[in-house]
Amino acid sequence: DLQEADLDLLRVTLSSKPQALATPNKEEHGKRKKKGKGLGKKRDPCLRKYKDFCIHGECKYVKELRAPSCICHPGYHGERCHGLSL
């Protein structure tokens, strides 16, 4: 089920806000495993592969881009929410 927040994140991602949303290097998801048939819902990569991708933010995997993005906690910014607002 697509939550309103997922839709919002997708809108933000596609409207390119590079300061608050990040995607890793292409090499990181260059080798894609073939989709297994009948395996059901795929595990969210944010829970494992990109668990520590966002420093001061929450990881959200954007399927359309096949990449994680970060939603920053207050006062933080940058690709991985690593920068502190002055």
Partner: antibody
Framework: QVQLVQSGAEVKKPGASVKLSCKAS????????ITWVRQAPGQGLEWIGE????????YYNEKFKGRATLTADKSTSTAYMELSSLRSEDTAVYFC???????????????WGQGTLLTVSS | DIVMTQSPDSLAVSVGERVTMNCKSS????????????LAWYQQKPGQSPKLLIY???TRESGVPDRFSGSGSGTDFTLTISSVQAEDVAVYYC?????????FGQGTKLEIK
């Protein structure tokens, strides 16, 4: 629909500790933050701190650091706030709220629990 | 810490009147990354939990009547109720989320004459 249900009223003696709970439903628990705010009788709102269940990150108001501990149980979608070394000035209604985001940033509280009244008295 | 100061502390107006209340922050709340002001407004009716009205200084939360509007930038912000209704009796709080610790204004109490 989104709901935050808080535990019932508590009466504690000075020096004791209390653990309040906030059970979330109707949304993906790990996607949002849970913040804690208190309101003393007849007073305004005071931010205590917040936890992001997805990452486990916690942030505290310096005033409550060392006395407040925020935790979250993702398996039950429940957030907790423990407050120790209670004093009479801690008498207040304690609210939990969902911290939402837009435009790539968190920061505002779009759903609130009903509040838990904590009374600290000898 | 960022200090939020609201004015006036209280005001009384008649039903149908336009009302404005102010919130001033001790430093700019403008995020340079998205050019938006990290300020929210809440309404708290007697005996109830606060309710989100406005975020990003001027974005109305879903379901909030359009008589409520927010404006301002940098350090000075305003909440306007274009035509006050009896059910608007409440305390209104502003809150900054520019940086930690998150802070609230002391509130503005709205009463009906």
């Amino acid at each position: 629909q989104v709901q935050l249900v808080q535990s019932g009223a508590e009466v504690k003696k000075p020096g004791a500790s209390v653990k309040l709970s906030c059970k979330a439903s109707g949304y993906t628990f790990r996607t949002y933050g849970i913040t804690w705010v208190r309101q003393a009788p007849g007073q305004g709102l005071e931010w205590i701190g917040e936890i992001f269940p997805g990452s486990g990150n916690t942030y505290y108001n310096e005033k409550f650091k060392g006395r407040a501990t925020l935790t979250a149980d993702k398996s039950t979608s429940t957030a907790y706030m423990e407050l120790s070394s209670l004093r009479s000035e801690d008498t207040a209604v304690y609210f939990c709220a969902r911290e939402s985001f837009s435009d790539g940033y968190y920061g505002y509280f779009d759903y609130w629990g009903q509040g838990t009244l904590l009374t600290v008295s000898s | 810490d960022i200090v939020m100061t609201q004015s006036p502390d209280s005001l009384a107006v008649s039903v149908g009147e336009r009302v404005t209340m102010n919130c001033k922050s001790s430093q700019s709340l403008l995020y340079s990354t998205n050019q938006k002001n990290s300020l929210a407004w809440y309404q708290q009716k007697p005996g109830q939990s606060p309710k989100l009205l406005i975020y990003w200084a001027s974005t109305r939360e879903s379901g909030v009547p359009d008589r409520f509007s927010g404006s301002g930038s940098g350090t000075d912000f305003t909440l306007t109720i274009s035509s006050v209704q009896a059910e608007d009796v409440a305390v209104y709080y502003c809150q900054q989320y520019y940086r930690y610790p998150l802070t609230f204004g002391q509130g503005t109490k709205l009463e009906i004459k």
